[in-house]
């Protein structure tokens, strides 16, 4: 029962995590304009992995896609790649883990096969979570570097009368969503791996059986035959769980936060 709960919880946590990774990847607020030097701006800038946006105080929001591929910074491309790899691995992991769930009965699938699939999905979730965390962290590091560079530029060469306020960017909401989502996916993956250990066929020690030969009192005591500790078949301990398959219809969609006026 604990194994089923651990596996189920791992699946749900990973599902939420992957949904979060997808949301973070699609979000436009990876970096937002730092308002420390100009808190009364009538124009607010923010950027995502795929486009940059400008929100005017009038309510009008204009977003422009990064239509160039070669002209983009290598770091941004790397972050995109990490997030996409994370999503793909997570999606495959979810697909595998659905069939691995103990509460779902698929034909005569054995526990050992489910254990295999649970471990596979767990590893996929772990890698997916790590990809997301890495992607977000690389972007955050890029922001910090640019922030201090623009700060240095801001306070040099300001002898003239005309002030040029340089736009600096700080952490956007997507970074925090990405970190949390990556963490959840990672935790979900670990839970799946833990559940896998419980799903694996347990070691079976057959009790000694005495065979009494007629006329002879010789006892045959076969040594403790141990079942394979690998993920091979174990027909002796096969159990059928006919818990109904559950559909995951409650996955939240993430609406766009930008209204085009």
């Amino acid at each position: 029962m604990a194994v089923t709960a651990c596996q189920g919880l791992g699946f749900v946590v990973s599902l939420i995590g992957i949904a979060g990774i997808i949301a973070a990847t699609c979000m436009d607020q990876w970096s937002t304009q730092d308002l420390y030097n100009n808190p009364v701006t009538a124009v607010f800038n923010y950027q995502g992995l795929w486009r940059s946006c400008v929100r005017e105080s009038s309510g009008f929001t204009e977003c422009r896609g990064y239509f160039t591929l070669l002209g983009l910074p290598a770091m941004l491309q790397a972050v995109r790649a990490l997030m996409i790899v994370g999503i793909v691995l997570g999606a495959i992991g979810l697909l595998v883990s659905i069939f691995a769930l103990k509460c779902i009965r698929i034909g005569s699938m054995e526990d050992s096969a489910k254990a295999n699939m649970t471990l596979t999905s767990g590893i996929m979730f772990i890698v997916s979570g790590l990809c997301a965390i890495a992607g977000v962290s690389v972007f955050a590091n890029m922001l910090v570097t640019n922030f201090w560079m623009s700060t240095a530029n801001m306070y040099t060469g300001m002898g003239g009368m005309v002030q040029t306020v340089q736009t600096r960017y700080t952490f956007g909401a997507a970074l925090f969503v990405g970190w949390v989502a990556g963490g959840l996916t990672l935790i979900g993956g670990v839970m799946m791996c833990i559940a896998c250990r419980g799903l694996a066929p347990e070691e079976t020690n057959y009790k000694a059986v005495s065979y009494h030969a007629s006329g002879h009192s010789v006892a045959y005591k076969p040594g403790g035959f141990k079942a394979s500790t690998g993920f091979g078949s174990n027909t002796k301990n096969k159990k059928i769980y006919d818990g109904g398959a559950r559909t995951e219809d409650e996955v939240q969609s993430y609406p766009s936060k930008h209204d085009y006026v």
Epitope: A42, V54, S57, G59, E62, Q166
Partner: antibody
């Protein structure tokens, strides 16, 4: 057709108070930021205050800060300007305007209401 | 606060001639995010309310005659009336719409010579 109609202007003594209203129609009032702009007799335009669509952001000109309060009632499609501690230099025609257009531009203006501060 | 300095204060131009109004800002009004300048031009005819002419420093509002054009970037902006018409007699104002307070220039009165 977008319409902005100001009211509430009049003659008031220095130190007195007045509340200006602006009734909006012809557009989704609750979706747009609103401004008050004034023009003293024979002088140029002076921006007074701004309030965002949901009242989350409010800004004032330094000359009126602490004395004037901008507010809005979206269900009533109304904009207000509460003016306290009025001075002679506050004498002007007060316009309400909306940033209905791109670029934060003040696209639509009311006809204005006259405020005279005199003893 | 952003200070906008308009020049000249008044301008007398013959009908059909070019009128040029300058507006200088104490701070850059250029927004890197969308590569646009947040300066707006208004026209106020005698006894009337102001009307929007140009936004984003150079984009004409629909319905505005093409003899009106805006140019400039950063801190220096210009409004040009290529061929002055009688109905163009008015006071022209530039406005900073980049940061609060949304300051106006002092205005330039355009008259017919």
């Amino acid at each position: 057709e977008v319409q902005l109609v100001e009211s509430g202007g009049g003659l008031v003594q220095p130190g007195g108070s007045l509340r200006l209203s602006c009734a909006a129609s012809g557009f989704t009032f609750s979706s747009f930021g609103m401004h008050w702009v004034r023009q003293a007799p024979g002088k140029g335009l002076e921006w007074v205050a701004y309030i965002s669509s949901g009242s989350g952001s409010i800004y004032y000109a330094d000359t009126v800060k602490g004395r004037f309060t901008i507010s809005r009632d979206n269900p009533k499609n109304s904009l207000y300007l509460q003016m306290n501690s009025l001075r002679a230099e506050d004498t002007a025609v007060y316009y309400c305007a909306t940033s209905y257009y791109y670029g934060n531009a003040l696209e639509y203006w009311g006809q204005g209401t006259t405020v005279t501060v005199s003893s | 606060d952003v200070v906008l300095t308009q020049s000249p204060d008044s301008l007398a131009v013959s009908l059909g001639e070019r009128a040029t109004i300058s507006c200088k800002s104490s701070q850059s009004l250029f927004n890197v995010g969308n590569q646009k300048n947040y300066l707006t031009w208004y026209q106020q005819k005698p006894g009337q309310t102001p009307t929007l002419l140009i936004y984003w420093a150079s984009t004409r509002k629909s319905g505005v005659p093409d003899r009106f054009s805006g140019s400039g970037s950063g801190t220096d902006f210009t409004l040009t009336i290529s061929s002055l018409q009688a109905e163009d007699v008015a006071v022209y104002y530039c406005q900073n719409v980049y940061s609060y307070p949304l300051t106006f220039g002092g205005g330039t009165k355009v008259e017919i010579k």
